[in-house]
């Protein structure tokens, strides 16, 4: 399987909410001994590999933000902890999973990574990640709503 990032760049005004999205693609093993672990974290475009370093998102670690479930189940993170920090990560039945960040500030700008681990008990873990950039802007040059740039091209879309 692979992880797709529909948008590689999100440009948002300060105070706006944004939902960063990843999508699981390809064949997904639905055996009873296969489970999935999904999470989000901040990172940097490291020399060795993008997304290798795991930094907190608004003080919440990737452990705090993880989703755990079998292949077909939907899941959400611990509501209380995440929502206290204006965050919510969620996953649906169709391979989409996302993190929503509320009331963006300039400090939220940076590289965000989604991580999917396919756990094949008795065999191995298979991990795949996706990366996307969030730019939070302020002042007269900031957009009125979030503008997202698809990963495949630089055509932008506005999210209201």
């Amino acid at each position: 399987f692979k992880v797709a990032t529909p948008y590689s760049l999100y440009v948002c005004p300060e105070g706006q909410n944004v939902t960063l999205t990843c999508r699981l693609l390809g064949p997904v093993d639905k055996g009873h001994d296969v489970t999935f672990y999904k999470t989000w974290y901040r990172s940097s475009r490291g020399e060795v590999q993008t997304c290798s370093e795991r930094r907190p998102i608004r003080q919440l670690t990737f452990q705090d933000l993880h989703l755990h479930h079998g292949g077909h189940q939907a899941a959400q993170t611990s509501h209380d902890l995440a929502q206290r920090h204006g965050l919510e990560s969620a996953s649906d039945h169709h391979g989409n999973f996302s993190i929503t960040m509320r009331n963006l500030t300039l400090l939220d700008s940076g590289l965000y990574c989604c991580l999917v681990v396919e756990i094949r008990h008795h065999h191995s873990e298979h991990r795949v990640h996706g990366a996307m950039e969030l730019q939070v802007q302020t002042g007269k040059d900031a957009p009125s709503n979030c503008v997202v740039y698809p990963s495949s091209s630089q055509d932008s879309e506005q999210i209201t």
Epitope: T35, Y37, S124, E125
Partner: antibody
């Protein structure tokens, strides 16, 4: 902050079953792998196996025929049973939290188990 | 199973000196390697994950490097509390395996 605490008898007779319990406090047991590792005197660390929160287990092939790991989520505990023990099973036994695609990040303080008649 | 070989078995150094510990895998583990520190009577403590990332709260004097089969843990300037046994551990597949350990002792 999540903490782990091992408990169980410190002395087990040869051919009997070693039974240890790990109690998880300060966090949920309903995620991650929950592992057992041991360190025999003068030797290195050996991974025994884990139970995933969902109930799936995975054991070291070298011990698989003798090991059972179980979980009781209502008590926030997971347990190790090692049957037909010999002196070679004398070790400090640790329980630990293992996060997928990460590491064994939180460990109990360990409990010494001696196999002797 | 993947065998991890650590060298040297013992490293005798003085505080302030640089420590370089090696871990070699019998087959590639990509960068899925962790380092732990263990002091007498204590549980192991996670230092490095994914070969080169410091775990939370680990001082900057600890650094990891390498990928594939050869890995290094470096302690840039030894503090008195750094004298301990260090283990590497792979997680590219199960069973999880550890190296035999390197003891860093005071010279």
């Amino acid at each position: 902050q999540v903490q782990l605490q091992e408990s169980g008898p410190g002395l087990v007779k040869p051919s009997e079953t070693l039974s240890l319990t790990c109690t998880v406090s300060g966090g949920s047991i309903s995620s991650y792998y929950w592992s057992w590792i041991r360190k025999p005197p003068g030797k290195g660390l050996e991974w025994i196996g884990y139970i995933y929160y969902s109930g799936s287990t995975n054991y070291n092939p070298s011990l698989k025929s003798r090991v059972t790991i179980s979980v009781d989520t209502s008590k926030s505990q997971f347990s190790l049973k090692l049957s037909s023990v010999t002196a070679a099973d004398t070790a400090v036994y640790y329980c630990a939290r293992d996060i997928p695609a990460f590491a064994l990040d939180i460990w109990g303080q360990g409990t010494m188990v001696t196999v002797s008649s | 199973e993947i065998v991890l070989t650590q060298s040297p078995a013992t490293l005798s150094l003085s505080p302030g000196e640089r420590a370089t510990l090696s871990c070699r895998a019998s087959q590639s583990v990509s960068y899925y390697l962790a380092w732990y520190q263990q002091k007498p009577g204590q549980a192991p403590r996670l230092l490095i994950y994914d070969a080169f990332n410091r775990a939370t709260g680990i001082p900057a004097r600890f650094s990891g490097s390498g990928s594939g089969t050869d890995f290094t843990l470096t302690i840039s300037s030894l503090e008195p509390e750094d004298f301990a046994v260090y283990y590497c551990q792979q997680r590219i597949n199960w069973p999880l395996t550890f190296g035999g350990g390197t003891k860093v002792e005071i010279k």
